[in-house]
Interface confidence: medium
Amino acid sequence: MGLSTVPDLLLPLVLLELLVGIYPSGVIGLVPHLGDREKRDSVCPQGKYIHPQNNSICCTKCHKGTYLYNDCPGPGQDTDCRECESGSFTASENHLRHCLSCSKCRKEMGQVEISSCTVDRDTVCGCRKNQYRHYWSENLFQCFNCSLCLNGTVHLSCQEKQNTVCTCHAGFFLRENECVSCSNCKKSLECTKLCLPQIENVKGTEDSGTTVLLPLVIFFGLCLLSLLFIGLMYRYQRWKSKLYSIVCGKSTPEKEGELEGTTTKPLAPNPSFSPTPGFTPTLGFSPVPSSTFTSSSTYTPGDCPNFAAPRREVAPPYQGADPILATALASDPIPNPLQKWEDSAHKPQSLDTDDPATLYAVVENVPPLRWKEFVRRLGLSDHEIDRLELQNGRCLREAQYSMLATWRRRTPRREATLELLGRVLRDMDLLGCLEDIEEALCGPAALPPAPSLLR
């Protein structure tokens, strides 16, 4: 039914062996539940366990590589431990009645055996050279070839649990983590925003004067316009930073590169999986060769949408790492229906996770020079920030939106509230920005007083 892993891909039956069939039939009735056993074990000093039939006796646990054959007969007497048989192991001191079965590397997943199973260590499986692990569950991974980044450059090299991150050359876009020629880009696809429109040859009567002069006039005109634009942008950034420091309290900008500095060609937002080290959910993002995902939501033309009316589209799906499956022990989520913005000052203001307007309001009202500090405080790593910048290289706001969307997806619903953002902004001395965000979303009349939000 609700299996913690895919059938036929079951992990070593550690839980099963702990919970059923471990004890001989004569002892089963006397063994307390696991929780009770833990409580009772704590009565004995470390390295000892309580005798299942006589709780005044503490027996010595068995060393790794062995299992419990018979409990100690009395205080100070040895526990009868036997070595694990071939094909089984125990990796730590224990009082298990059976050793654990050795794992087998899964050939259909491309896995190879790094080291064989021994009495005190399970089989170690891995991937071949120039391959990476794509995790489907905590212990189940599939091996894929690292991308070579043909027609592009390696932005982040292939790692044990992460594919290469490619940056495509001009005239190419990223699809399935491969750089594909823009000539293969159809209008309906996501690549349209990455492939600049090709200037079509205008057929007409050949006028030698026009053919020479017109391109020159256009060229110089464009140069002037771009210089003007750069100048305006520079002044705008300075003005915006100054304004923020006035409006949003004590703003001491970080001396670090802003997101605008990213000039590399962005990765196509690609919602397939990518590996994640260990069991910590990190949401950096890299595609997997097996499949590419495309959003059914249509992209609004232009690199940066109009923020007055943000498009009804969530940031690129799964801007994040692979599915690391929590095992059957993973805690079940606390049911928490989505709360809309409400006028009540007594309820925590929960972000409407399906409404981009909320996230865009945050993007618009946090000073650009403090942005990286802000998302770091929300828990994003530098690696994730860099990757999201790269993926949205042409548009600062979209990169920032993606970072917030990543935070929102990783944070339990109950915690993804304006209250949490408020705490972070308050810690950054940017309380004024929080008020701006609230005002942008609700209008001054609908808002509860700010202090009640941040209590």
């Epitope: 609700g2 299996l3 913690s4 489907w136 569950s137 999986f273 959910p281 949401l283 959003s295 059914s296 939501s297 009804r312 589209e313 969530v314 799906p317 799964y318 994040g320 790492a321 692979d322 599915p323 690391i324 499956l325 929590a326 095992t327 993973a330 805690s331 079940d332 989520p333 606390i334 049911p335 928490n336 229906p337 989505l338 996770t353 399906d354 997806r409 990783r410 339990p412 619903r413």
Partner: nanobody, 120 residues
């Protein structure tokens, strides 16, 4: 207890259609994005499709784009996969998967799977 129960699989001819269902229980269905993942015989796992909590946004693998449609009915706690223009390479066990609480893209529960066989 979280339970995901797939149904609707079976034998179908190339070009035919099937609709898979996944009945969910034991958690607040509307709070989670949901996904379909498949495993062809003797092969690794492959992503098929994903849908957001409200059913507004859907995402597909290139291999199924334009042929498969994912949908959900939050009032019935059910996830669907409408499969049209089926091909032999779509033969696989299809799993319905629920993300864990800490991030939408890490799965902690899968159904038992339903076998789809496309053959003439």
């Amino acid at each position: 207890e979280v339970q995901l129960l797939e149904s609707g699989g079976g034998l179908v001819q190339p070009g035919g259609s099937l609709r898979l269902s996944c009945a969910a229980s034991g958690f607040t269905f509307a709070d989670y994005q949901m996904a379909w993942v498949r495993q062809a015989p003797g092969k690794g796992l492959e992503w098929v499709s994903r849908i957001d909590r409200g059913g507004f946004h859907t995402y597909y693998a290139d291999s199924v784009k334009g042929r498969f449609t994912i949908s959900r009915d939050n009032s019935k706690n059910t996830l669907y996969l409408q499969m049209n223009s089926l091909r032999a390479e779509d033969t696989a066990v299809y799993y319905c998967a629920k993300p864990s609480w800490h991030a939408d893209q890490y799965f902690d529960y899968w159904g038992q799977g339903t076998l789809v066989t496309v053959s003439s």
